[in-house]
């Protein structure tokens, strides 16, 4: 039952997209006082596993040692303290990257963009798809996602972006999935470096910020959650 | 519910100024370029200046070019334009309105009036 | 700068009835083309972007179709709330152009 105590946090290392076959540790970080971790899976008996905590008991490991398409899902962990069971904590999304064939990206019309114009990377598939992702390198969150209308099985998404700036370029890739399941990605497509030269008007200094590319709103950030963070891509559904 | 909000017009003189603001809310406005696009009388749309979402990067329609200045305070979710040396011709309904990072504008104000007459 | 010539500029039509606008742009705008509409003393509104996708709460009786120079906007079924001027504008390339209207009417 869920108390007044405080929420873990629940965390991937080395992080959260994790490729066929590697080992992954998922960390739930609670109180000094937590006697017991829970974490519990989307779509699975509860709990999904329990760990003792390791000293000095503020958090606990559970380990994945090769990343299968069983592992890929949403997670929530909880811990308990002498006076019962915490809040969940925010849910962690576990992506497996590998499941399917590798998509390609290219930008229309050049992967050479002036500012204040405008380009459209594509993502085609070799096999229909529903979901294409695109991520930009080094973008604080970098997924971004765009579904196919209806459901229906597509071979390609286009992601446009204008006015581009400076800050768009980068280094692209992107990623097809079916959309019964999310956690489930192909292969990464091979990168794409869009270059953007010098501004048509008023270039000022870049701040040091991470900002938006493609098919979302400019600069808006997405969560593989949805949510809106403060920064990076925004996810994009069609 | 993403709100955009214009004050600031009125009447002036040719030649003088005048200086508009958005007021934004229902988004995190630090995230989004932002654009002004006037509506002279009975006339269609015509786009103004852009700003990118940190101000990084700014541009202007050629016919305001030098006399406009479009800014942003992320801090007080509020956008700007300061138009100086007033003509006639910018006689016009000013919207501000959000970019959606596609080409287009996906939110827009209601609107301030700015009348420029002798 | 891009050039956007809409037609009709005016149009009167029945509800019920299916209409169609067309923009043409000067030079290839690829699909940056949007479509907005206008009620008397009201700010527009986005209804189409990127030529064909659906702006968030649009009645999916408004659809657009092009690529290049020639797109074309259409209303499958007229309601009488569909009464407004409709706009086109390429998003191609700053400066950001808009067509010159077209105002919808009842027969």
């Known amino acids: 039952q869920a108390g007044p105590l405080p929420k873990p946090t629940l965390w991937a290392e080395p992080g959260s997209v994790i490729s066929w076959g590697n080992s992954v540790t998922i960390w739930c970080q609670g109180t000094l006082e937590a006697r017991e971790y829970r974490l519990d899976k989307e779509e699975s008996p509860a709990p999904w596993d329990r760990q003792n905590p390791l000293e000095p008991k503020n958090k606990a490991r559970f380990s994945i040692p090769s990343m299968t398409e069983d592992y890929a899902g949403r997670y929530r962990c909880y811990y308990r303290s002498p006076v019962g069971w915490s809040q969940p904590s925010d849910p962690l999304e576990l992506v497996m990257t590998g499941a399917y064939s590798k998509p390609t990206l290219s930008a229309l019309p050049s992967p050479l963009v002036t500012s204040g114009k405008s380009v459209t990377l594509l993502c085609q598939s070799r096999s229909p798809m529903d979901t294409f992702l695109l991520i930009k390198e080094r973008a604080a969150h970098p997924l971004l996602h765009l579904r196919s209308e209806h459901g229906a099985q597509q071979h390609q998404a286009e992601f446009p972006m204008s006015p581009v700036t400076s800050v768009h370029g980068g280094t692209y890739r992107c990623f097809s999935s079916h959309g019964f399941s999310h956690y489930l990605l192909s292969h990464p497509s091979d990168p794409l470096e869009l270059i953007v030269s010098g501004s048509l008007e008023d270039p000022r200094p870049s701040p040091t910020r991470s900002v938006s590319t493609a098919a979302g709103p400019e600069d808006q950030p997405l969560m593989p959650t949805g949510s809106v963070p403060h920064s990076g891509l925004r996810r994009h559904w069609e | 519910e993403v709100q955009l909000v214009e004050s600031g017009g009125g009447l002036v003189q040719p030649g003088g100024s005048l200086r508009l603001s958005c007021a934004a809310s229902?988004?995190?406005?630090?995230?989004?370029?932002m654009h002004w696009v006037r509506q002279a009388p009975g006339k269609g749309l015509e786009w103004v200046a852009y700003?990118?979402?940190?101000?990084?990067?700014?541009y202007y329609a050629d016919t305001v070019k030098g006399r406009f200045t479009i800014s942003r305070d992320n801090a007080k979710n509020s956008l700007y334009l300061q138009m100086n040396s007033l003509r006639a011709e910018d006689t016009a309904v000013y919207y501000c309105?959000?970019?959606?990072?596609?080409?287009?504008?996906?939110?827009w104000g209601q609107g301030t009036t700015v009348t420029v007459s002798s | 700068d891009i050039q956007m010539t809409q037609s009709p500029s005016s149009l009167s039509a029945s509800v019920g009835d299916r209409v169609t606008i067309t923009c043409r742009a000067s030079q290839d705008i690829s699909k940056f083309l949007n479509w907005y509409q206008q009620k008397p003393g009201k700010a527009p509104k986005l209804l189409i972007y990127y030529t064909s996708r659906l702006h968030s709460g649009v009645p999916s009786r408004f659809s657009g179709s092009g690529s290049g120079t020639d797109f074309t906007f259409t209303i499958s079924s007229l309601q009488p709330e569909d009464i407004a001027t409709y706009f086109c504008q390429q998003g191609n390339t700053l400066p950001w152009t808009f067509g010159g209207g077209t105002k919808l009417e009842i027969k």
């Open positions: 229902g988004f995190t406005f630090s995230d989004y370029g």
């Open positions: 700003i990118f979402s940190g101000s990084s990067t700014i």
């Open positions: 309105a959000r970019a959606d990072g596609r080409g287009a504008m996906d939110y």
